[in-house]
């Protein structure tokens, strides 16, 4: 369960890939599209509001006999729109929604090497936001094997 309904902190940051491509958001035909692209030098990076929530993870689920806490985030590039996992389509989409947000809008935050982070679907453990064919997609990762895979690594910069 997510502790309380308000985030423990929020920050505005631009999101880029391990390879320094920018995640950008464009309004097209009354819906938002998400792109992964090289930005021209003078172009301003899109900012995302990251809201951080503390989630209690009961020992019955944790598998190691102790309660734990996770840090979860929601990502909102513009008012009332949030990134959401579409597990059926293995896609990442922007949806307009009201609070309380659906579970599909929450991602477990992982610290990674090179001061990168990864975003794991709350609704589908082992599935992460990643980059595929210049778009964001949901990527299944074998935790024991390949957590260093660059396509699920992101940089946050204020």
């Amino acid at each position: 369960s997510i502790t309380g309904i308000s985030p423990i902190t929020e920050s505005l940051a631009s999101l880029s890939t391990y390879n320094d491509q920018s995640i950008t958001f464009a309004l097209e035909d009354e819906s938002y599209e998400i792109y992964v692209e090289d930005l021209k030098k003078d172009k301003k990076k899109d900012k995302v509001l990251l809201s951080y929530y503390e989630s209690q993870h009961p020992s019955s689920e944790s598998g190691d006999g102790v309660d734990g806490k996770m840090l979860m985030v929601t990502l909102s590039p513009t008012k009332d729109f949030w990134l959401q996992a579409n597990n059926k389509e293995h896609s990442v989409e922007l949806h307009k929604c009201e609070k309380p947000l659906p579970d599909q809008a929450f991602f477990v935050l992982h610290n990674r090497s090179f001061n990168c982070v990864s975003f794991e679907c709350k609704t589908d453990p082992g599935v992460f936001i990643g980059v595929k064919d210049n778009h964001l997609a949901l990527i299944k990762v074998d935790y024991s094997e390949n957590l260093g895979s660059e396509n699920i690594l992101f940089k946050l910069s204020e």
């Epitope: 190691d64 006999g65 734990g68 806490k69 996770m70 935050l109 990674r112 001061n115 935790y143 260093g148």
Partner: antibody, heavy 121, light 107 residues
Amino acid sequence: QVQLQESGPGLVKPSETLSLTCTVSGFSLSKYGVHWIRQPPGKGLEWIGVLRAGGSTGYNSALMSRVTISKDTSKSQVSLKLSSVTAADTAVYYCARDHYYYSSYGGFVYWGQGTLVTVSS
Amino acid sequence: DIQMTQSPSSVSASVGDRVTITCLASQTIGAWLAWYQQKPGKSPKLLIYAATRLADGVPSRFSGSGSGTDFTLTISSLQPEDFATYYCQQLDSSPYTFGQGTKVEIK
């Protein structure tokens, strides 16, 4: 309950390699990062490095060329190796566990009791 | 690397006093700051995380504030068991650097 216990030789000769082990219980190394921190006598805390839940490592820039952190998941152990030691490496060495699953943002909630390592011939 | 500067390096205070310790980061770290208490011969104890969150079991006389580069630890009414050394630590980016410490001594 959660426990971390440092172990290793209390005396190391200059130019040799300092080797310490942190044995953990009550949690899984695949879910939590484990950090090494040291404290020279009468001085402040210095972060040495981390072994993250996903297996990647991060190190103090000043020590990076001499330090290696690794784990043996089957034994629930995280090891620290610091090569080419000098008297300046004399310190109490601590291991500590992240507050959050998978993330270091929440600080270190559980600490070992620390072990004093003296570098002297 | 991010430098953390604590002030003062020591403070003399009496039981019941309000004590304030500040920590300045050399670049913005959002809310990713922790405060620890350490007593002689003991391991550090987490007091505050995410700049303002009280760790489990920590008395409510301890509080944290700030974000970005400027942070404060406040002890609202100093108790005998609070005489110790306090450290801040940034957790925004590796290496996770500590401040140099503030010793709270009996006046």
